[in-house]
């Protein structure tokens, strides 16, 4: 049976899928589709890679990891309840019946009502350099923005607030990291 993954409405959903390239840069085609993996293909394709690059994608669907190293995990931006369902990751390894196929179940929950709905915007505006994301390029991370002048009290207060917030869950679930100091 498929593995289940969860996200809230308005969040980004993350569906993991990996393979190990035979050699660096020796990529195999991969497709992501909505619906369970059929016998040969990917269902309703939302993203596809070839031996070199992402060659097809639809809005809101992207690869946040380094697909050149075999991380072909799918990120779905700003999910709605309609995004719930089965997704197919198919690694189209050349040869006779070598495909690896994975069915992943995405469950979207209604958004929780939080007392501090502006926290995420405020935090990223004040501390843009604290967010690092996995990138497409050879570098493992991309640093966003530059560090503004802040004091330790601000950092401490915001870090405590962040620990219990939905943002902390968002960041942890999406694979982003928070660096303080």
């Amino acid at each position: 049976s498929e593995v289940e993954y969860r996200a809230e409405v308005g969040q980004n959903a993350y569906l993991p899928c990996f393979y190990t390239p035979a050699a660096p840069g020796n990529l195999v085609p991969v497709c992501w589709g909505k619906g369970a993996c059929p016998v040969f293909e990917c269902g309703n394709v939302v993203l596809r890679t070839d031996e070199r690059d992402v060659n097809y994608w639809t809005s809101r669907y992207w690869l946040n990891g380094d697909f050149r190293k075999g991380d072909v995990s799918l990120t779905i931006e700003n999910v709605t309840l309609a995004d719930s369902g089965i997704y197919c990751c198919r690694i189209q390894i050349p040869g006779i019946m070598n495909d690896e196929k994975f069915n992943l179940k995405l469950v979207i929950k209604p958004a929780k009502v939080t007392p501090a709905p502006t926290l995420q915007r405020d935090f990223t505006a004040a501390f843009p350099r604290m967010l690092t994301t996995r990138g497409h390029g050879p570098a493992e991370t991309q640093t966003l923005g530059s560090l503004p002048d802040i004091n330790l009290t601000q950092i401490s207060t915001l870090a405590n607030e962040l620990r219990d917030s939905r943002l902390a869950n968002d960041l942890r679930d999406s694979g982003a990291t928070i660096r303080i100091g």
Partner: antibody
Framework: EVQLVESGGGLVQPGGSLRLSCAAS????????MSWVRQAPGKGLEWVAA???????YYPDSVKGRFTISRDNAKNTLYLQMNSLRAEDTAVYYC?????????????WGQGTLVTVSS | EIVMTQSPATLSVSPGERATLSCRAS??????????MQWYQQKPGQAPRLLIY???NVESGIPARFSGSGSGTEFTLTISSLQSEDFAVYYC?????????FGGGTKVEIK
């Protein structure tokens, strides 16, 4: 208009080889899984080989190791290389397009090409 | 492999009558709530033509008198009122597993 046109059939001796071609037009060939399906005279349909859009290959045991399916997306052409042919391989060979997003069933077929294996 | 068995081998029907063709799979062809079963029509000297996919979905351009039903291992193709152009051989096919397999066919002939 989707068109699939097979060629390359003919008479061949047992143990011989033949290469079938299927020229595709009217659709984005590279996006589709493609198959070969055969039909012996007076008999039913038998799936022979498939190649996915990503190039993965599939065969039934009856032809595995003897037949090779391949595709040239630049030429919009599907191929079937048949080696070590046997009398029981005598059939009309159809090129068939797998349904988009699935590939496991066939929404367009060629007219077929006859392969006769006989001494 | 999944073995597909069609019955009857030959069905004699008068024009205007209803025809019911059966197909049984040796194991279930259900997959995430969908029956991966198709039906094709083949006339002499012609390539097969897709009629029904996923057990009950009528292919574009196919007359409404053709319908499919069933789930699991038992499937039916129904032609509600046979027209002269419907006399042909009909095949079922499963697309759950490799090897893809077809039934032996049912010949629908004029009574």
């Amino acid at each position: 208009e989707v068109q699939l046109v097979e060629s390359g059939g003919g008479l061949v001796q047992p143990g011989g080889s033949l290469r079938l071609s299927c020229a595709a037009s009217g659709f984005t060939f590279s996006r589709y899984a493609m198959s070969w399906v055969r039909q012996a005279p007076g008999k039913g349909l038998e799936w022979v080989a498939a190649i996915s859009s990503g190039g993965s290959l599939y065969y039934p045991d009856s032809v595995k190791g003897r037949f090779t399916i391949s595709r040239d997306n630049a030429k919009n052409t599907l191929y079937l290389q048949m080696n070590s042919l046997r009398a029981e391989d005598t059939a009309v060979y159809y090129c068939a397009r797998g349904r988009e997003a699935d590939g496991g069933y066939f929404d367009y077929w060629g007219q077929g090409t006859l392969v006769t294996v006989s001494s | 492999e999944i073995v597909m068995t069609q019955s009857p081998a030959t069905l004699s029907v008068s024009p205007g009558e209803r025809a019911t063709l059966s197909c049984r799979a040796s194991e279930s062809v259900e997959y995430y709530g969908t029956s991966l079963m198709q039906w094709y029509q083949q006339k002499p000297g012609q390539a097969p033509r897709l009629l029904i996919y996923a057990a009950s979905n009528v292919e574009s351009g196919i007359p409404a008198r053709f319908s499919g039903s069933g789930s699991g291992t038992e499937f039916t193709l129904t032609i509600s009122s046979l027209q002269s152009e419907d006399f042909a051989v009909y095949y079922c096919q499963q697309s759950l597993k490799v090897p893809l397999t077809f039934g032996g066919g049912t010949k629908v002939e004029i009574k």
